[in-house]
Interface confidence: low
């Protein structure tokens, strides 16, 4: 179980790196973040480490109310603060693993 979670963590972070460059990857991560109401791997600050095309931005899918451009100069109160690895991991442990 721990190995699966570690792999999932690494994979999620790797996909984050590809987010600005790969639309298919972006769609998958956007869906995960929106569905699980989470942002980033550990938390939303993970997006600061991604050399994406814009500064001070998280994906719009991190927003509590998703609208185009809502991730710009985001207000911390308006985005999901919980990380996706922990949140999705909890769901996996409960329902799959």
């Amino acid at each position: 179980r721990d190995k699966v979670m570690s792999e999932f963590n690494n994979n999620f972070r790797q996909q984050m790196e590809n987010y600005p460059k790969n639309n298919h990857t972006a769609s998958i991560l956007d869906r995960m973040q929106a569905d699980f109401k989470c942002c980033g791997a550990a938390n939303y600050t993970d997006w600061e480490k991604i050399p994406s095309m814009s500064k001070n931005r998280v994906p719009d899918s991190c927003c509590i109310n998703v609208t185009v451009g809502c991730g710009i100069n985001f207000n911390e109160k308006a985005i999901h603060k919980e990380g996706c690895v922990e949140k999705i991991g909890g769901w996996l442990r409960k329902n799959v693993l």
């Epitope: 639309n23 994406s52 185009v68």
Partner: antibody, heavy 120, light 108 residues
Framework: EVQLVESGGALVQPGRSLRLSCAAS????????MHWVRQAPGKGLEWVSG????????GYADSVKGRFTISRDNAKKSLYLQMNSLRAEDTALYYC?????????????WGQGTLVTVSS | DIQMTQSPSSLSASVGDRVTITCRAS??????LNWYQQKPGKAPKLLIY???SLQSGVPSRFSGSGSGTDFTLTISSLQPEDFATYYC??????????FGQGTRLEIK
């Protein structure tokens, strides 16, 4: 007031190189993605290349991939386009453009362009 | 790459007319569609981004709508300064950024 001023355009022979520059002012240059877009005489707009605020990501049109290199110097508030192995089909007016903060691919300000003519 | 197709390629209209230009994407681009205006000898100017958001300083007679693959730019009452070429551009799947071929709006 946002200003983008391109320079470096010239008449060059096929196979030669050229370096275009874009001097920016009126905004915090290192917060924004920047682009090069070209327009052949009497034709439409063609995106050439884009670069992120921190040079972490760069993109190129297939037509220039491997021949053109985009770069920026945030300290000098300048954008560059190194053009190698130039072809006749690269003849165009080259515009420098600034991306929106929250959507790097949307160009909200453009320079007046610099003309590149590739001919023998 | 996503292809953008504009129609018509050119159109003639009179001052005061309501004009609609359409843009179709080869696949769904959500609302990531932008419109630019270009006058002869001038650089393009951003009019609308994210399908319907009016860029600051652009007159309210310009409006955009649509999502998915079909989009429209509408000028509610044509003014003399609106005669120009209009381009749509997708910013969904990039790079590359792709533009439509342009629509030339002429005086009737």
């Amino acid at each position: 007031e946002v200003q983008l001023v391109e320079s470096g355009g010239a008449l060059v022979q096929p196979g030669r190189s050229l370096r275009l520059s874009c001097a920016a002012s009126g905004f915090t240059f290192d917060d924004y993605a920047m682009h090069w877009v070209r327009q052949a005489p009497g034709k439409g707009l063609e995106w050439v290349s884009g670069i992120s605020w921190n040079s972490g990501t760069m993109g190129y049109a297939d037509s220039v991939k491997g021949r053109f290199t985009i770069s920026r110097d945030n300290a000098k508030k300048s954008l560059y386009l190194q053009m190698n192995s130039l072809r006749a089909e690269d003849t165009a007016l080259y515009y420098c453009g600034k991306g929106l903060l929250h959507q790097w691919e949307v160009l909200d300000y453009w320079g007046q362009g610099t003309l590149v003519t590739v001919s023998s | 790459d996503i292809q953008m197709t504009q129609s018509p390629s050119s159109l003639s209209a009179s001052v005061g007319d309501r004009v609609t230009i359409t843009c179709r994407a080869s696949q769904s681009i959500s609302s990531y569609l932008n419109w630019y205006q270009q006058k002869p000898g001038k650089a393009p100017k951003l009019l609308i981004y994210a399908a319907s958001s009016l860029q600051s300083g652009v007159p309210s007679r310009f409006s955009g709508s649509g999502s998915g693959t079909d989009f429209t730019l509408t000028i509610s009452s044509l003014q003399p300064e609106d005669f120009a070429t209009y381009y749509c551009q997708q910013s969904y799947s990039t790079p590359p950024i792709t533009f439509g071929q342009g629509t030339r709006l002429e005086i009737k």
